[in-house]
Amino acid sequence: WELTILHTNDVHSRLEQTSEDSSKCVNASRCMGGVARLFTKVQQIRRAEPNVLLLDAGDQYQGTIWFTVYKGAEVAHFMNALRYDAMALGNHEFDNGVEGLIEPLLKEAKFPILSANIKAKGPLASQISGLYLPYKVLPVGDEVVGIVGYTSKETPFLSNPGTNLVFEDEITALQPEVDKLKTLNVNKIIALGHSGFEMDKLIAQKVRGVDVVVGGHSNTFLYTGNPPSKEVPAGKYPFIVTSDDGRKVPVVQAYAFGKYLGYLKIEFDERGNVISSHGNPILLNSSIPEDPSIKADINKWRIKLDNYSTQELGKTIVYLDGSSQSCRFRECNMGNLICDAMINNNLRHTDEMFWNHVSMCILNGGGIRSPIDERNNGTITWENLAAVLPFGGTFDLVQLKGSTLKKAFEHSVHRYGQSTGEFLQVGGIHVVYDLSRKPGDRVVKLDVLCTKCRVPSYDPLKMDEVYKVILPNFLANGGDGFQMIKDELLRHDSGDQDINVVSTYISKMKVIYPAVEGRIKFSHHHHHH
């Protein structure tokens, strides 16, 4: 018996087609992805093959203005239109709190939404009961397939699930649910979830009875043969893991942003054992036409977005200096504003010993693309912010050793004075540079804001300590020459859309007046630009 698994993960509000790098589509003939194009390909496969499941491994939420405006209603609407068979909850599904998950998505989705390792308690237990499930038995042709869901147990640090949801260890939670499915004589079982490729592989290895793992969270690109676009494969598709009980378990993921449709064909014997598995992600490029009826629906929903982007979010009573002359040479107040927003967006009081789990932010000055003039009645709009942060990136959470941070700050000024983008803006960090010293030895003071304290204060950076830092995904991926971050990071979790983070902060503050306040200093009498 053959099953075709079509899968997406980490779509992050890319409802419309995007450019090759998943930012805003400029030249339509070279654009990719989007739900209208995805639907065309899905329908083509459904017509051609008998036993097809369309699955999503989480993080549909967060990523573009679509989510900012529609808050998840767009996810339910278009996933319903595409007739998804099941979805696992990702960490970003909790970005607007539990209510922001229940109302727009859990109550509106026509397909089951799954997670076996999230347990509700207190008053939430009855409110959320039955809205998401640990497992689902899906009838496909004359057979049934069990799907068990899982979600990153780091979600309380990455999003806003509140205090009434407990995120258990994935493997511990999955095993009893898989055992139940076996008891029901369901002998073909897919683990569908959102904990990253390393956990996906561990689930394949450790959870007895799981036949296939369909994952997300780490934006992992797997491919067999010559890859069709810019993404470099982390391994073959499917990635085969040998389980502790000796079975070959295929593990798949489909990069992110709806650029690819994962396509996996599994052949099962009559006892539900995997005989063979093969496939590849399908690049959703312009050779695949956008479905006209879905496209028309997208255009209808788009109207509200255009109206939103010109509405006032809040006011500034100071000039927001995002000029390259400032942000690539010294502390600039636009950099401070963005970093303050980044930290504010990551406030999670999950431990009594810590005022917050993260206190530090770094931001490449080259990523700040425009100032905002306060002389326009102080008005700040989404459109204004899109000029400041035009690349459609995310502000991510990483864990780094102090030694890596020191290298990053040395890199920040290794060729100072050439108006290059690697000069770092900061939050929760006090850095002093001496530009008279040779490159690689210019950081003379680096103090960081404590987290395990009731009164935050600055302490010298410790080289061997592990720190959490919020930074743009561009830096986490080694951009602007920050290879040491990419090479040495101990953990990387994708965060919220950059503009959304800043816009939310401005809306919350109502009136802003960021200052230049001595976060970045230059020692001695050395003149700087």
């Epitope: 397909f111 499930l133 497992y135 038995v137 899906l138 029901l184």
Partner: antibody, heavy 119, light 107 residues
Framework: QVQLQQSGAEVKKPGASVKVSCKAS????????IYWVRQRPGQGLEWIGW????????KYNEKFKGRATLTADTSASTAYMELSSLTSEDTAVYYC????????????WGQGTLVTVSS | DIQMTQSPSFLSASVGDRVTITCKAS??????VAWYQQKPGKSPKLLIY???TRHTGVPSRFSGSGSGTEFTLTISSLQPEDFATYFC?????????FGQGTKVEIK
């Protein structure tokens, strides 16, 4: 809250067919199986089959295969059970039901529809 | 088909009594067993699923146990509203089957 509202009692002649409806409310109809169970007068319970409104797949008790047909109308959140070639042995209360977790017990029941087969 | 045999078929008890109903499966069903309560003219009510998990809103005096072929439903202290017929059901193998029922009457 979850509710399953069934159609009213029916009297049918032997050899005829009957179609019982079950209107679901208080939850998303396409996400849960609908099960059909019958209870003959003074007897135990008998499982007829299930339908998954998410993709209209069905499973029948072999005893009813060929005579029972389960269907669903997702736009009306309604499931149907049609039983053909009725005999007096089919006189029973017919129930629709829904689970909490797939297959694991019938948590929500319709009020039942009495079908009487008599000449 | 798997036969589910309940015993006893009838049971007379008083308020406050501890009552145990057993259900034997003709072949192993692991823990895929549910228990229902039914009152005359009413639909059945789910009490227990997965052999021992109480359904939402079911009083704690109802408990289930067992696995494989032998299962029990226990009412720790019988209340007036508990006089009814109780059915077990297996959902491990098709066709899903029910026990013939145990009627609990007032002594």
């Amino acid at each position: 809250q979850v509710q399953l509202q069934q159609s009213g009692a029916e009297v049918k002649k032997p050899g005829a067919s009957v179609k019982v409806s079950c209107k679901a409310s208080g939850y998303t109809f396409t996400r849960y199986y609908i099960y059909w169970v019958r209870q003959r007068p003074g007897q135990g319970l008998e499982w007829i089959g299930w339908i998954y409104p998410g993709n209209f797949n069905t499973k029948y008790n072999e005893k009813f295969k060929g005579r029972a047909t389960l269907t669903a109308d997702t736009s009306a959140s309604t499931a149907y059970m049609e039983l053909s070639s009725l005999t007096s042995e089919d006189t029973a209360v017919y129930y629709c039901a829904r689970d909490v977790y797939d297959y694991a017990g019938f948590a929500y029941w319709g009020q039942g529809t009495l079908v009487t087969v008599s000449s | 088909d798997i036969q589910m045999t309940q015993s006893p078929s009838f049971l007379s008890a008083s308020v406050g009594d501890r009552v145990t109903i057993t259900c034997k499966a003709s072949q192993g069903v692991a823990t895929a067993v549910a228990w229902y309560q039914q009152k005359p003219g009413k639909s059945p009510k789910l009490l227990i699923y997965w052999a021992s998990t109480r359904h939402t809103g079911v009083p704690s005096r109802f408990s289930g146990s067992g696995s494989g072929t032998e299962f029990t439903l226990t009412i720790s202290s019988l209340q007036p509203e508990d006089f009814a017929t109780y059915f077990c059901q297996q959902y491990s193998s098709y066709p899903w089957t029910f026990g013939q029922g145990t009627k609990v009457e007032i002594k």
